[in-house]
């Protein structure tokens, strides 16, 4: 066949769906690769063709759209499964073509099984709630387009294995789950199951997400440098190892980039000739406040190094701070005889 623009396997779109549930999958060409939509393509005389390669096979084959009860169908740029089977797993290709134009992309589809508590290999989206912040809601995700607005589905919410009922601060409200006051104890996996009828059959959509309760913006502060501080002096003799930790606390801030860096005499360590290594470690509190520690290390410090200015800097969306470390050269203890002589005023 003639040349076709092949966008390859779009592994960014690793689609995972549950066994025995409906799935609607849009052809990624129109979402990520082409500058026009399906309607434009269709009215220009282009045809959308679907085919697939089964798991652990190399052979591309057409999708069977003549299965009982139209189990697999295509509607515009959407491939429908009503419902999926485990062996639908494979790489799916959508190809847009006419006699003069061709473009195609493949994407992996994985049909997964869940256990009785909704655990599965599915990668879960994470929804962050602010601690003690007032009413916050999560919404049952990715259920648009499965049923018309005239259909009233039933929605059951679970936390882990258990239906959410009589919880003090979590209230199911249809497609939404309301947290009156989010607490650390609300951390966990939440599942909504949407049940709806279609053509005399009942379908279920299961969606699980992870809720993580994080620090509230009400309590957020600029970075706090715990070390270096005014109470600790780094007193070294030439030839010793100099180790200065910079420990900074960052309040949790949604989408904030937390940065810590050292300057030596106003320059980044990379820009100066001395042999400096910097090791960073990061720890998080239960509400995702962050503590970053950067340890500046000079293996064999010189008297020149001990005269330099060592400043720890930190920056977040809340502001920027800096703190200099107190570094000085240790004065060698005078020899005993000299000290005595001086003490007795000898000349």
């Amino acid at each position: 066949s003639e040349r076709c623009d092949d966008w390859g396997l779009d592994t960014m779109r690793q689609i995972q769906v549950f066994e025995d549930e409906p799935a609607r999958i849009k052809c990624p060409l129109f979402e990520h690769f082409l500058k026009f939509n399906y309607s434009t393509a269709h009215s220009a005389g282009l045809t959308l063709i679907w085919y697939w390669t089964r798991q652990d096979r190399d052979l591309e084959e057409p999708i069977n759209f003549r299965l009982p009860e139209n189990r697999i169908s295509k509607e515009k740029d959407v491939l429908w499964f009503r419902p999926t089977l485990l062996n639908d797993t494979g790489n799916y290709t959508c190809m847009l073509r006419n006699t003069t134009y061709c473009s195609k992309v493949a994407f992996p589809l994985e049909v997964v099984q869940k256990d009785s508590c909704f655990n599965s290999p599915m990668k879960l989206p994470v929804h962050k709630l602010y601690i003690e912040y007032g009413i916050q809601r999560i919404t049952c995700p990715n259920v648009d387009g499965y049923f018309p607005s005239s259909v009233k589905p039933t929605i059951t919410w679970y936390m882990g294995c258990y239906k959410i009922q009589n919880f003090n601060n979590v209230i199911p409200e249809g497609m939404n789950l309301s947290f009156l006051i989010a607490l650390i104890s609300n951390n966990g996996n939440y599942t909504c199951v949407v049940t709806y009828p279609e053509n005399g059959r009942t379908f279920h959509l299961t969606r699980t997400l992870t809720v993580k309760v994080v620090g509230s913006p009400k309590n957020a502060v600029p970075p706090v440098i715990h070390s270096p501080n005014d109470h600790v002096v780094y007193e070294k003799e030439p030839g010793e190892e100099l180790l200065i930790p910079c420990t900074v606390y960052f309040s949790f801030l949604m989408d904030s980039r937390n940065e810590v860096w050292w300057t030596i005499d106003g320059k980044k360590p990379d820009d100066i000739t001395i042999d400096v290594t910097i090791n960073e470690s990061i720890s998080h509190s239960r509400t995702e406040d962050e503590t970053r520690t950067q340890i500046l290390s000079i293996k064999k410090v010189t008297s020149e190094d001990l005269k330099r200015s060592y400043v720890c800097h930190a920056r977040s969306a809340k502001g920027e701070v800096a703190k200099a470390a107190k570094v000085k050269q240790k004065v060698p203890a005078p020899r005993y005889t000299v000290e005595l002589a001086c003490g007795f005023g000898a000349t």
Epitope: D20, D115, N166, T195
Partner: antibody, heavy 117, light 107 residues
């Protein structure tokens, strides 16, 4: 379409055991709960327990705990209910009922178990 | 266990009548209530799940309502094929429990 086909009627002696099968088709057997419900002659419905074939998780009604065993064979999409130490009051029609969640969406045709000496 | 009390235990109504069956739980069940229909000599069939959700293929003359401990099944216009026993069932807390049933007959 979903179909649950149960094994045939059984006549059992008191103190013995009975094992009723329920063969499922038309849905993903591993991904739904299989419930067992019984109905004594002229009486109402009584839930006995359920199993999730995907991971073997079971829940039993306290009344039947220790006397009933639910199992599932994923390779044949068949669920089993075994009731031991039978007594005359266990005479009933035993139903399997499939439910993706907790409601029992589809039921088998029922198996009559008669316990008589 | 949660007790489910259904009333009436039986009723007789004419074709076209509006029929109401009630079910009371011994404690709140948060709308986790199903209704089943069982015709003589047959297995039960799910009619309504989660208080008011019509199961696929069930005629729209059947409807459910209620909250807390009190729930209702309504047949808006009784048809001859509706002759059956109707059971409510709670699925709020294990073990699932059924009401005693309501036998519906045609006058």
């Amino acid at each position: 379409q979903v179909q649950l086909v149960q094994s045939g009627a059984e006549v059992k002696k008191p103190g013995s055991s009975v094992k009723v099968s329920c063969k499922a088709s038309g849905y993903a057997f591993s991904s739904s709960w299989m419930n067992w419900v019984r109905q004594a002659p002229g009486q109402g419905l009584e839930w006995m327990g359920r199993i999730y074939p995907g991971d073997g998780n079971t829940h039993y009604a306290q009344k039947f705990q220790g006397r009933v065993t639910l199992t599932a064979d994923k390779s044949t999409s068949t669920a089993y209910m075994e009731l031991s130490s039978l007594r005359s009051e266990d005479t009933a029609v035993y139903y399997c009922g499939e439910g993706y969640l907790d409601p029992m969406d589809y039921w088998g045709q029922g198996t009559l178990v008669t316990v008589s000496s | 266990d949660i007790q489910m009390t259904q009333s009436p235990s039986s009723l007789s109504a004419s074709v076209g009548d509006r029929v109401t069956i009630t079910c009371q739980a011994s404690q709140g069940i948060n709308n986790y209530l199903n209704w089943y229909q069982q015709k003589p000599g047959k297995a039960p069939k799910l009619l309504i799940h989660y208080t008011s959700g019509l199961h696929a293929g069930v005629p729209s003359r059947f409807s459910g309502s209620g909250s807390g401990t009190d729930y209702t099944l309504t047949i808006s216009s009784l048809e001859p094929e509706d002759v059956a026993t109707y059971y409510c069932q709670q699925y709020s807390i294990l073990p699932w429990t059924f009401g005693g049933g309501t036998k519906v007959e045609i006058k």
